[in-house]
Interface confidence: low
C-alpha cells in the first residue's frame, strides 16, 4: 500500500512544485520524493523496505498520476542509497538518495529544489509547505493529482512532550503541527519546504495522522548535509 497521505489539504497548483517526485513501485505511487540535483532524488529510507523484488522508478514533472502531461517522465533508478544508519524500527536517519538512470530533462515543470545547508532549527510557527499524492482522508481515498498543505513548525520541546512524541525527536528531526491538517506515512519522502528551501523530508513511521497530539515528524536535511554531499559527489 502507498505510504502516506496529505490530510486536510487541497489540490496543488499544477506544476508549481517542479521539484516534486513520485517514487513508484511496479508502476504505482509509493512515496514522495524531491529532486535535489539533476540526477538525484531525495526520499525516505523506509520507503524501499518492502520493495526488494519490485521495480523502483521515479516520476518527475507530474501533477496527475494518471493523465498524460507533456512534462511527465518516468525514470529508472540506477542506484538507491539509503542512509547507512537508517533502521527498520526507528525514525532516525530516514533518508534515501535515488540516482536516476540519466540526468533529468529540466524545464518549467522539472527543477531541483535548493536544500538547507545551515544546521539551524526553523523558527516555531513558520508556515511550511508539504505536498504529496498520499491518501486524503481516513477512508483511504487516493488522489490522482498532487495535494498540498501549509503547516506551522512546532517547537521541539512541545513535540517531545510525554503526550506527543515523548522524547523521540532528536536535533536531527523537526515537527510540524497536525491539527486535522497533516502529512502522513504515504507522503513519506516528500518535501517540507519553508521559504522556498527544502528543510525537511517526511518520515515514514507508522504515525497516526491528523491527531494534534502526534505532530508530523520530518528529517532535517541540514543535519545530513555532509552525507548528501558525499553521495552526490
Amino acid at each position: 500500500p502507498p505510504r502516506g497521505r496529505i490530510l486536510g489539504g487541497r489540490e496543488a497548483e499544477a506544476h508549481a512544485r517542479p521539484y516534486m517526485a513520485s517514487v513508484q513501485l511496479n508502476g504505482a505511487h509509493l512515496c514522495g520524493g524531491v529532486l535535489v540535483a539533476e540526477q538525484w532524488v531525495l526520499s525516505a529510507a523506509h520507503c524501499l523496505e518492502d520493495a526488494a523484488d519490485g521495480k523502483v522508478q521515479v516520476l518527475l514533472g507530474a501533477h496527475s498520476l494518471s493523465q498524460p502531461e507533456p512534462s511527465k517522465r518516468l525514470y529508472d533508478v540506477l542506484r538507491a542509497v539509503p542512509h547507512p544508519d537508517s533502521q527498520p524500527d526507528t525514525i532516525d536517519h530516514d533518508l534515501l538518495l535515488l540516482q536516476l538512470s540519466e540526468k533529468a530533462t529540466l524545464g518549467p515543470a522539472v527543477r531541483p529544489l535548493p536544500w538547507q545547508r545551515v544546521d539551524r532549527d526553523v523558527a516555531p510557527g513558520t508556515l511550511c509547505d508539504v505536498a504529496g499524492w498520499g491518501i486524503v482522508n481516513h477512508a483511504g481515498r487516493r488522489p490522482d493529482s498532487l495535494q498540498h498543505v501549509l503547516l506551522p513548525v512546532l517547537d521541539r520541546a512541545t513535540c517531545n512532550r510525554r503526550t506527543h512524541h515523548d522524547g523521540a525527536i532528536t536535533e536531527r528531526l523537526m515537527c510540524a503541527e497536525s491539527n486535522r491538517r497533516d502529512s502522513c506515512k504515504g507522503d513519506s519522502g516528500g518535501p517540507l519546504v519553508c521559504g522556498g528551501v527544502l528543510e525537511g523530508v517526511v518520515t515514514s513511521g507508522s504515525r497516526v495522522c491528523g491527531n494534534r497530539k502526534k505532530p508530523g515528524i520530518y528529517t532535517r536535511v541540514a543535519s545530513y548535509a555532509a552525507w548528501i554531499d558525499s553521495v552526490l559527489a
Partner: antibody, heavy 114, light 108 residues
Amino acid sequence: EVLLQQSGPELVKPGASVKIPCKASGYTFTDYDMDWVKQSHGKSLEWIGHINPNNGGTIYNQKFKGKATLTVDKSSSTAYMELRSLTSEDTAVYYCGTGDFAYWGHGTLVTVSA
Amino acid sequence: QIVLTQSPAIMSVSPGEKVTLTCSASSSVSSSYLYWYQKKPGSSPKLWIYSTSNLASGVPARFSGSGSGTSYSLTISSMEAEDAASYFCHQWSSYPPTFGAGTKLELK
C-alpha cells in the same frame, strides 16, 4: 461514524465507588487518547485526564489524582473511569471525549446521595 | 494552570445581530491550541472552532474565530435561532487543559 457510548445515570452512596464505561466505535480505538471531563451543575468543564489506549499510559489533572483511575479494554474498544471515595462534590455529568474532543460521549450523570 | 475567563456570562441577541464572545487567558496560549465548543441543554459539547480560527465540519460560515496570546474571540456575523446555546473556550497549550465557564447565548 464515530460514536462514544456512555452508560446511564448512576446513583451511588457516599464513600462508594463507580466505574463508568465509554465504548468507542467508528474509528481505530488505539489511534487517539481518550479524555475525561467533569461538568458540575452550573460550573465550568474540568479536564480529569486522558489515557493512551495503545499502552495504557495516563496523565491526570493533579486535582483528580487519587479520585479518578482511567483504564482501557482494547479487546472491546472500551475506556473506563473509576471514581472512588465519592462525596456530594463528585455529583456531576462525566464525559468521555476523543479525537482531541472532536467527538464526545453523551455523558453519564453520577449522583452521590445517601 | 491557565484560567480562561469568558464574557459576558449571558448575552441576549436579536436575530440578524452581530455577536462577539470573548475568552481571556491568564497567561499566553498558543493559537494552535485554542478551541471553542457549542453546547445545548441535554446534549454533549460539539467541537465548533479549532486552532483559533478553523471551523469544525458542519459549522456555518457565519461563525469565525480570531485572537492570539491571551485574547481570543468567537464572532457570529448574523445571529440565527439555531445559534442559541452555550459556547465554551478551551486551551490545550499547557497542562492541565482548561475550559472557560462559558457564555450562554439567548435569542431575544
